[in-house]
């Protein structure tokens, strides 16, 4: 007789995630020296260990531990890069400018990007059916602390000048609910962290309008302002034309406004 | 605290000379890092970029192409701008402005706050 399975109401665990962990974690440490003590089995087995077996609308910061410990990585901490609905920008940007970084630009970032997984309670297995949607479930459901856990961190370790990339299409620009606005923003250390300067990106060609006067953006700048942190902003007009100008600032487009 | 600090400006006969300088705060950033420009606004007109430079790459307003020279001296953290036959059209605001990456693709990183540039006939 087939074991009833409990129906969640988001996608099931990606396929081979096992492997794809795996595999991620050793393209990841060969390619990143300071990365190399690492042990990809011993991070498998921590990642596994901390949703196996468990409720998936049960899980804690602390399932997360072991292998927060395992994948701990020292980033410069003046080079951070936060985004918020706007990802693939922000991972091209940090593919050129190579000493900023991006959560996905660390291991535990990388190991995660894309993917979705939970288990069963009292069971070895692995969901490949289902896992819970944190609207329509549950929150604490094993991606989403694994997301909140080490947005935290990552957000706990910048210091100097902290960037984020905004997407100027949303109708929130800025969303008290997104991972940024729900949990790194009030993770910056005001003791370490100067000023966080968002690059708010537009969307249309003919959009010209200053969007760092959006209403959102002023409730960033509130929330921030009031934990003691300078805020600025910046418009990024034309994202291509950004994107071409990190890559070589030399370009004679560059020094021209056309 | 004031970034970008503009010198040089003044009232001039047309067919003179003036040398515009810009001077950065060495703690907030160095020029040579930067993407330096000039910009004038005349009254009733938009702002627009007439010379900017980074590293070997310089570019020039055709208005002012052959006139207007934009230099720097990095030991200094200074951009200049040297202004040759100048005409009554010439007359504006002149501002300094910097970027990390470039000009023209979003709002710039730092502005002067502007010197008068007057060309009488």
């Known amino acids: 007789v087939p074991r009833w399975r409990q129906q969640w109401s988001g996608p099931g665990t990606t396929k081979r995630f096992p492997e794809t962990v795996l595999a991620r974690c050793v393209k990841y440490t060969e390619i990143h020296p300071e990365m190399r003590h690492v042990d990809c089995q011993s991070v498998w087995d921590a990642f596994k260990g901390a949703f196996i077996s468990k409720h998936p609308c049960n899980i804690t910061e602390e399932d997360y531990q072991p292998l927060m410990k395992l994948g701990t990585q020292t980033v410069p901490c003046n080079k951070i890069l936060l985004w918020s609905r706007i990802k693939d920008l922000a991972h091209q940007f940090t593919q050129v400018q190579r000493d900023m970084f991006t959560l996905e630009d660390t291991l535990l970032g990388y190991l995660a990007d894309d993917l979705t997984w939970c288990g069963e309670f009292n069971t070895s297995k692995i969901n490949y059916q289902s896992c819970p949607d944190w609207r329509k479930d549950c929150s604490n459901n094993p991606v989403s602390v694994f997301w909140k856990t080490v947005s935290r961190r990552f957000a706990e370790a910048a210091c100097d000048v902290v960037h984020v990339m905004l997407n100027g299409s949303r109708s929130k620009i800025f969303d008290k609910n997104s991972t940024f606005g729900s949990v790194e923003v009030h993770n910056l250390q005001p003791e370490k962290v100067q000023t966080l300067e968002a690059w708010v990106i537009h969307g249309g060609r003919e959009d010209s309008r200053d969007l760092c006067q959006d209403p959102t953006i002023k409730e960033l700048e509130s929330i921030i302002s009031k934990r003691n942190i300078q805020f600025s902003c910046k418009n990024i007009y034309r994202p291509d034309k950004f994107l071409q100008c990190v890559k070589n600032p030399e370009d004679s487009s560059c020094t021209s406004e056309i | 605290q004031v970034q970008l600090v503009e010198s040089g400006g003044g009232l001039v006969q047309a067919g003179g000379s003036l040398t515009l300088s810009c001077a950065a705060s060495r703690s907030i950033f160095e020029i040579n890092t930067m993407t330096m420009g000039w910009y004038r606004q005349a009254p009733g007109k938009q702002r627009e970029l007439i010379a900017a430079?980074?590293?070997?790459?310089?570019n020039y307003a055709d208005s002012v192409k052959g006139r207007f020279t934009i230099s720097r001296d990095n030991a200094k953290n200074t951009v200049y701008l040297q202004m040759n036959s100048l005409k009554p059209e010439d007359t504006a605001v002149y501002y300094c402005s910097a970027d990390r990456y470039g000009f023209g693709y979003g709002d710039n990183d730092y502005w002067g706050q502007g010197t008068q540039v007057t060309v009488s006939s």
């Open positions: 430079s980074r590293g070997a790459t310089t």
